[in-house]
Amino acid sequence: KLTIESTPFNVAEGKEVLLLVHNLPQHLFGYSWYKGERVDGNRQIIGYVIGTQQATPGPAYSGREIIYPNASLLIQNIIQNDTGFYTLHVIKSDLVNEEATGQFRVYPELPKPSISSNNSKPVEDKDAVAFTCEPETQDATYLWWVNNQSLPVSPRLQLSNGNRTLTLFNVTRNDTASYKCETQNPVSARRSDSVILNVLYGPDAPTISPLNTSYRSGENLNLSCHAASNPPAQYSWFVNGTFQQSTQELFIPNITVNNSGSYTCQAHNSDTGLNRTTVTTITVYAEPPKPFITSNNSNPVEDEDAVALTCEPEIQNTTYLWWVNNQSLPVSPRLQLSNDNRTLTLLSVTRNDVGPYECGIQNELSVDHSDPVILNVLYGPDDPTISPSYTYYRPGVNLSLSCHAASNPPAQYSWLIDGNIQQHTQELFISNITEKNSGLYTCQANNSASGHSRTTVKTITVSAELPKPSISSNNSKPVEDKDAVAFTCEPEAQNTTYLWWVNGQSLPVSPRLQLSNGNRTLTLFNVTRNDARAYVCGIQNSVSANRSDPVTLDVLYGPDTPIISPPDSSYLSGANLNLSCHSASNPSPQYSWRINGIPQQHTQVLFIAKITPNNNGTYACFVSNLATGRNNSIVKSITVSASGTSPGLSAGA
């Protein structure tokens, strides 16, 4: 396909652009360029005739265009007015036209910008700073960079004046950074030199690291203090209120139980005169303590909640271990360990995640185990199941239905008959039932913790007479030699015998016929067209029997190899050729004919009047069954002799 590529697409004023032609057809008469998206004569820039290799200017020619033999167009010394679409019109030697449109945009070059500021040393949480990008330039986009990153989203940052001005309200220490502005258009981008904003702040409450407060006897204690501050803070350490040293780090080698106590770090900012302190309590153990498990959620909800189990206490240089169901942790995408193995997170808990869970702390000689923790996962209720599964009962028997739904806490059950509440029990018992007890029996399971309810409805029919059964099928249109069909005799009834008939006869013995489900289900494997029969099921008990209406199996088959009639293959000139094609198929196939490979008509009968030797050749009948997706064909050779030349030939139809 003929296409135009503008190189470049965005062009700087004064530069040049090449409208590059791709897929130029061969055998050309000529081509012509136009300003705009149409081939209008008054917008012609330049035309080129291949035969004469002559380029001739048009009404829109400016003197800055050069056309090349490959049809590409160079436009030099670009001006703003050159922006827009350009159309190439190609006339091929066969005088067929092709057109393609390209476009480019023109922009000016930009000068290097600079930043002006209204405050060079603002105070945190007090001052505002306004930066302005100079100079003001038309058709330019203004961008701002903080530490060479684009602007963060913040309600304290406001762009105004077409993004030329950046205002920082209530400056914070995080605003201490290198600020640059940039002017951009599609052909140039210029960045200013950086302006450093120096915000005075602090000190904040110091942080003592590492965070762990439990140590073993004999270890080294190395505490570091840091407080955010500008200018940087000066630090002092106190142990149990007694001054120790004026350093940022406190180091005590080979600690003992006597080094347990409160450790205070004080940070001081000489510019603001402010002091802040932080205290941590350090415990030194002679031996590791027995671990215990804490949980962030004691009653998680299935498929909703995550649970984080943490092994306490936090001890430096310690290995943490976990067990679930007295086994080491299984590999699962729902189980995640923290970097130090101290926290085990179960994502999207399930009812199978109850545990027990144990954690351990390993020392040189042994592993100390925590007590086991069991999760109480709330779930359900699932859809309740009503048993037994019978739907037909005889009068006089006892009806005993039981309902169960998986649930934690255990579900509360209610029974309804025909929508009317009966009782709040798991089991429903009705003695000596009559026809009046027929109806819709609903079991409702409710989980009081989650507030969720689920119901199951069962139709109960009480009748001395068995109902007329019906046949349900899992496949109404099976394909021969491919599909299986399962017939099921409905309904399921108590103390009932199920029987089957095919075409009024009892079931034939066949490895393709299988009875299951107490003879309620009849399965035909690998159906054939011969299985397209009337199937009847029957139910009987000691007092009654009944048969279903017949269900006829509609087996899709074929098309078989077609037969062309009549069988004659030799004809006399002048006879009528009347060929009929037939193929066994369900549903009936679609027919089509080809003579010497050339498609003819989509009919079952092919009729040609007064044939001649020109009608010699191969006659193919094609059959296709859209339902089975299968096709078939047959080919017949027909010879037509001139009249009287070959005695004994058929005279045709």
Epitope: S32, G41, H89, N97, A100
Partner: antibody, heavy 116, light 111 residues
Amino acid sequence: QVQLQQSGAELMKPGASVKISCKATGYTFSDYWIEWVKQRPGHGLEWIGEILPGSGRTDYNERFKGKATFTGDVSSNTAYMKLSSLTSEDSAVYYCATGTTPFGYWGQGTLVTVSA
Amino acid sequence: DIVLTQSPASLAVSLGQRATISCRASQSVSTSSYTYMHWYQQKPGQPPKLLIKYASNLESGVPARFSGSGSGTDFTLNIHPVEEEDTAYYYCQHSWEIPRTFGGGTKLEIK
């Protein structure tokens, strides 16, 4: 091959609006202008305007500005012309056409009859 | 707008003879490389059919008895020899600018 299939004939009341469709097949619909041409019974051809479906760019004959509105749906390869405030003067056969300039492919035409 | 004037409005030509249809533009529609004039044929109940593009280029599939000539403002469509099937209306159209106007049409009958 290139084909333009236009919508069927329309009988409209004066003052009403009608929207004629032109479904294109056999080429890249978005890349070529669709022209609209009017022919009143027993009269010649009158150029209404054109649309480039890919960009939605339109050009109208001044005589038809406010009368005709062109739209294009690239997803269904269909161009539309809406004629508003119909009068008896708008009774005509309307054609769509396309191809590289000039226009070698035409729809079969849509007859619009305006009658009280 | 460019006005295209066709003449004659109708003509009758004997089978096998030459038919000549003229189209005059109110301003030039030619550059030094191209002429932006085209000819269409329209039969009753049918859309127009492109015959000649750019004044003299025969559209693919159009019989060679059709020919076009002219530049600037004066253009001619010739049909020789005319055949029965050439009975139709013939229109010229320019593509010099927007709007692209058509000529008033010429009705050709075969005697």
